[in-house]
Amino acid sequence: QSGPLPKPSLQALPSSLVPLEKPVTLRCQGPPGVDLYRLEKLSSSRYQDQAVLFIPAMKRSLAGRYRCSYQNGSLWSLPSDQLELVATGVFAKPSLSAQPGPAVSSGGDVTLQCQTRYGFDQFALYKEGDPAPYKNPERWYRASFPIITVTAAHSGTYRCYSFSSRDPYLWSAPSDPLELVVTGTSVTPSRLPTEPPSPVAEFSEATAELTVSFTNEVFTTETSRSITASPKESDSPAGPARQYYTKGN
């Protein structure tokens, strides 16, 4: 065979966000008949020569970036994509609130605020049901976020985490859930994404304002721009491309 072997996949089961003291399994998956696997924790000189790492109880020392590769004969594969294993519950939970409130009319504005008592400079927001299992969500590193006009797809349960960029894999416990209700909407199935979107936003300031747009085509915070997005090929037909206008603060 010419060239390196194809890279394996690396997954954390059931999730790469792991509460302290809870179990998680890291699994490296290559083609059948692999001679040797190597799973390594980056920036630590720690490794194992097995495809599966079972962590019976998550600890701070195990949080970090992992990757794996495999060997067939004398050939080594390309390394897997990195997996970020995050320990949650390391710090007290932040509070999540909606301004002006958790009930908003379709087309209205809403701002989600994640507040922490600590001087953390990073926040992560997620919507229940997202991301798809074992799939890392998109991430941003921005200081502030504009408000985006909401749609029916914004309805759902939200939580946020806070953490420090100095220890990016040690997160707080999740905030209490916030139920966002978008009223006055009539949603046809053809307008819905075929799978839930996967937004996670990280941003600075101990009290941070965040507004998110959930579509399976666009997740953006660019200020004062009209954005047109075409559906992905894998999506079901969704009619014409949707347009969103993001307001500046």
Partner: nanobody, 129 residues
Framework: QVQLQESGGGLVQAGGSLRLSCAAS????????MAWFRQVPGKEREFVAV?????????DHADSVKGRFLISRDNARHMVYLQMNSLNPEDTAVYYC?????????????????????WGQGTQVTVSS
Amino acid sequence: QVQLQESGGGLVQAGGSLRLSCAASGVTFDSAAMAWFRQVPGKEREFVAVISTESGGRTDHADSVKGRFLISRDNARHMVYLQMNSLNPEDTAVYYCASSLLYCSASGCYANRDSYDYWGQGTQVTVSS
């Protein structure tokens, strides 16, 4: 639930011996590196010795205890031991058993407390002069 339970500490005269034991449960014992650390109040936790299953077993001891302390393990019983001979008052400390799920590939990695994931509660060793 992972548990490491130390025993065997106590008060001993200088020049005497003690054997510390660590019982491990809830961890894949035969694929883990096991170590002993010690800590004196007000000081950093200090590496004492490590034993891993890598390449059929490998041990390393801190310079301060080489020739006096010996680490060993019994995989069938999920036990790790630290035989301590020729004890002196400087060996007085709380001794902790530690377990790592992963091997180390760099020198000094096993001596770094951050390389260990699970810790026991410790057992006090006091050496009187």
